[in-house]
């Protein structure tokens, strides 16, 4: 019977007695940047071609065996992960081993570079179709190697890589805390976050997503028949460079940006139990597990966007925290979220030709983060229209103005360290929904964007009695771009986009004052490109 | 043994082909920073990935490395190359003392410089 | 180009041992084992065991166990078959094929067994 | 061990015929099925491997089809040099095991 994790990413339209989806990866070359491996083990040969590529410290300890199959043992077993012709997820990649890992796991940042190296000149030399690196490996947060995988992304390269197995915030490892690196965690059978003895799989807003990596079935170094059973992040990362294989084999012209935003889109949502998370981390990690697309075609046609956090500014007064979008996404909208409540809102700036999202801290807080709204909007042209404080007591409002623009995002930054509460709220008038309202104290800032076929609308949710949590979500069809609190009293911790739900925190009900203070509105912007289809058409 | 000779010739050769006014000054207001593992059993100290400005030519990245094998032989300090990197990032990977990196952070075309670091399969 | 080229035909006595060769050529060794598949004359094809090049591990027919033996000399790139205690029904032509997947073979070694 | 069993055992056929062979295997072998070629006094060719698919420099007049335990080679118009025996492998299990054969002869 099919394995569970081969099982768990496959859609239901493909599930037969055997896993067997249309066209395994094979026009897909993928790079595994491992141990050696048994490359003429049943599940992998032919599959796999060993390079002579090897950069790996001497093993530790004076008394230790170099046994052959327990240094095959992880790039064996992750090899037929990926391409295996039984328990492998793309059975039709084809795959090419360098070994940065020694027969006891180790490896060096120095090692990993050289290899990575070697890939980019290899790829200069014979360019080939679409390229996957996997880097199932991890090592404290390194400056070097995270430029390195930067810098071979730019190059076409899609990089997936292994949160880690620390228990701990996968920022703070590398190449997991690249921006550009795909970062998969690991979940089991149950959907649940994988515990590996004491530790168990890393969290945290540098993770993209989750992947089955507990008891995954594999090759087993031990003979050239045998299967094992491993655990850990590699496990899980193996999966999702086997299914961006599978993407890419079916979309070969997938840029990184596109390749990210559709493994999010077909993720299965909300499954996994977020309990296990550290407290402060649970808004951070992505609730994601990796699956395959139901179906390539028709994908293009949708407007695809995702959410990215920005790391903690600190608790100074001034402390600011900056989301970007990856280089060919764009930032539809920006909000901001601190636990404390303290926080003086956020903006759109542009930043190297960019725009970025910015938040800032208040006198008093505990940090703020910043999060971006990254959207695939082929052909757009975005600006950011801004309105300072009003004096009138009707509250700031800025529109967009241009013919053509539709409104995407809004936000609001303030100077005052509190904006008054008492205040009663102002409400957006009806039948203009291309506008943001806000506090008469705050700057208002609208993200504002021509695309074809670009069509936005805006949906409200307000509760007018407290309450922690208030959601609003775009309906079928429709993406959220936008997502913010009407108007930004201060006891709203923030607002932040959950896959196609805009969420608004407000401090615990028990510490609000009256409930005409309580009332807190959601604000959704959702969109949809009409057009994709016709204009990718018509570019063609 | 053999090994450290050969090291000793290279430097030697790498003197006399170098003139002795030799540190240029990093260009005026950047200054290159160090960069080291937070997880110390991690550390790998001895070897430095040595980072230069993007638009380094794979010559300046060799010339910038021979540079600092001759400052340091000039200090007594034996070094070694081991890797010259281009096609990603230009740098170099040297083995070399820990006191040298205050020198090696002053060379024309310097970025940032790292000290190596272990990885583990996951 | 990717072959398998064997050593030529044999006339063992009952009782006798015969070793047959297989030198590869073309392709990259490490990634592929050797098959090893006998076909005795007018008779189907019976595979008889794998080696691998790469660390010179075995997996055996039930129906060899005990008499024959294979073996790799990856600086020749030469896998070898031996066969043991041989028996008139072990007249065969005896072929040696790349990996599991069986894509390419060798020419055939005819090994006769009579007194 | 997994029993496969072809048929015909040979058939008669000629020039710009189509042909077809089945293989049955005595228990499901998903589209583990590879087809082989032999021509007197010589090695056998693979011609389809994984029930379907034809390797580089094989004429697209042969073809596989089937999954679990029924399978068909077919030869959509015979030419000369297709005279020859055909083997089915089941390649699900170890060992890998062989149908008997089919002989196709000049009719």
């Known amino acids: 019977s099919i394995p569970w994790n081969l099982e768990r990413i496959t859609p239901p339209r493909y599930r037969a007695d055997e896993y067997q989806p249309p066209d395994g990866g094979s026009l897909v070359e993928v790079y595994l940047l491992d141990t050696s491996i048994q490359s003429d083990h049943r599940e992998i040969e032919g599959r796999v071609m060993v390079t002579d590529f090897e950069n790996v410290p001497e093993e530790d300890g004076t008394r230790f065996h170099r046994q052959a199959s327990k240094c095959d043992s992880h790039g064996t077993h992750l090899a037929g992960v990926v391409s295996g012709r039984d328990a492998g997820v793309a059975k039709g990649a084809s795959m090419r081993s360098l070994r940065v890992l020694n027969c006891q796991g180790k490896g060096t940042v120095s090692g990993t570079l050289i290899g990575l190296e070697f890939i980019r000149k290899s790829q200069l030399v014979q360019p080939v179709g679409p390229l996957v690196v996997l880097l199932p490996l991890a090592g404290g947060y390194s400056r070097v190697l995270n430029a390195a995988c930067q810098r071979l992304a730019r190059a076409g390269v899609v990089l997936v890589t292994a949160a880690g197995n620390f228990r701990d915030d996968a920022c703070l490892y590398s190449p997991a805390s690249a921006p550009e690196v795909i970062t998969v965690g690991a979940t089991n059978a149950q959907d649940q976050p994988v515990t590996l003895g004491t530790l168990g799989t890393n969290f945290g807003r540098c993770v993209d997503l989750f992947a089955p990596g507990e008891d995954i079935i594999g090759a087993s170094s031990d003979c050239s028949t045998c299967f094992v059973s491993q655990s850990g992040t590699s496990q899980a990362a193996a999966h999702v460079a086997g299914i961006a294989a599978m993407m890419l084999s079916a979309e070969p012209e997938l840029t990184l940006a596109e390749l990210r935003q559709r493994l999010i889109h077909f993720s299965a949502k909300d499954v996994i139990n977020e309990a296990w998370f550290p407290e402060d981390q649970r808004v951070l990690t992505p609730n994601l597990v990796a699956a395959l697309p139901p179906s390539t075609h028709g994908a293009g046609w949708q407007l695809f966007c995702r959410t990215v956090w920005s790391a903690h500014s600190g608790p100074t007064r001034m402390a600011t925290a900056v989301a970007r979008c990856a280089p060919d996404e764009e930032l539809l909208s920006c909000s901001s979220f601190s636990r404390s409540g303290k926080r003086r809102g956020e903006r759109m700036e542009a930043q190297g030709g960019k725009l970025v999202c910015r938040a800032h801290n208040a006198f008093g807080g505990e940090g703020v983060y910043a999060i971006a709204r990254c959207c695939l909007l082929p052909q757009a042209n975005c600006s950011v229209h801004t309105a300072p404080p009003a004096e009138a007591s009707m509250g700031t409002r800025v529109h967009c103005h241009q013919q053509g623009h539709v409104l995407t995002g809004c936000s609001s930054h303030w100077e005052v360290e509190d904006l008054g509460t008492h205040k009663p709220p102002v409400l957006r008038p009806r039948g203009q929904p291309n506008q943001c309202v806000g506090h008469r104290e705050a700057s208002i800032h609208a993200s504002c964007c021509h695309a074809p076929g670009l069509e936005c609308k805006v949906k409200e949710h307000g509760i007018p009695a407290p309450q922690e949590q208030v959601t609003v979500a775009c309906e079928e069809g429709w993406t959220l771009t936008g997502c913010s609190a009407l108007p930004g009293t201060s006891h709203v911790l923030g607002a932040y986009a959950v896959d196609n739900t805009c969420v608004v925190r407000s401090r615990d009900v028990s510490t609000t004052g009256s409930t005409s203070e309580g009332a807190v509105t959601a604000v959704a912007i959702c969109c949809r490109s009409r057009h994709l289809a016709q204009a990718s058409q018509e570019l063609q | 043994q053999e090994d450290e000779d050969g090291d000793y010739e290279e430097l030697v050769l790498a003197l006399r082909s170098e003139e002795d006014g030799l540190a240029e000054a990093p260009e005026h207001g950047t200054t290159a920073t160090f960069h080291r593992c937070a997880k110390d059993p991690w550390r790998l100290p001895g070897t430095y990935v040595v980072v230069l400005k993007e638009e380094t030519h794979l010559s300046q990245s060799e010339r910038t490395a021979r540079r600092l094998q001759a400052q340091a032989a000039r200090r007594g300090y034996l070094t070694k190359i081991l890797h010259v990197f281009h096609g990603l990032l230009p740098g170099f990977l040297v083995k070399m003392s820990g006191d040298l990196l205050e020198l090696a952070l002053k060379l024309p075309h310097v970025d940032y410089i790292e000290e190596d670091s272990s990885v583990f399969a996951q | 180009q990717v072959q398998l080229v064997q050593s030529g035909a044999e006339v063992k006595k009952p009782g006798a041992s015969v070793k047959v060769s297989c030198k590869a050529s073309?392709?990259?060794?490490?990634?592929?084992?050797i098959s090893w598949v006998r076909q005795a004359p007018g008779q189907g094809l019976e595979w008889m065991g794998w080696?691998?090049?790469?660390?010179?591990?075995?997996n055996y027919a039930q129906k060899l166990q005990g008499r024959g033996t294979m073996t790799t000399d990856p600086s020749t790139s030469t896998a070898y078959m031996e066969l043991r205690s041989l028996r008139s029904d072990d007249t065969a032509v005896y072929y040696c094929?790349?990996?599991?997947?069986?894509?390419?073979w060798g020419q055939g070694t005819t090994v006769t067994v009579s007194s | 061990d997994i029993q496969m069993t072809q048929s015909p055992s040979s058939l008669s056929a000629s020039v710009g015929d189509r042909v077809t062979i089945t293989c049955r295997a005595s228990?499901?072998?998903?589209?583990?099925l590879d087809w082989y070629q032999q021509k007197p006094g010589k090695a056998p060719k693979l011609l389809i491997y994984?029930?379907?698919t034809r390797p580089s420099g094989v004429p697209s007049r042969f073809s596989g089809s089937g999954s679990g335990t029924d399978f068909t080679l077919t030869i959509s118009s015979l030419q000369p040099e297709d005279f020859a025996t055909y083997y089915c492998q089941q390649d699900q299990d170890i060992p890998p095991t062989f149908g008997q054969g089919t002989k196709v002869e000049i009719k």
């Open positions: 080696v691998s090049f790469y660390n010179g591990n075995t």
């Open positions: 073309g392709y990259a060794l490490y990634n592929y084992g």
């Open positions: 094929a790349r990996g599991y997947v069986m894509d390419i």
């Open positions: 994984a029930a379907s």
């Open positions: 228990q499901s072998i998903n589209n583990w």
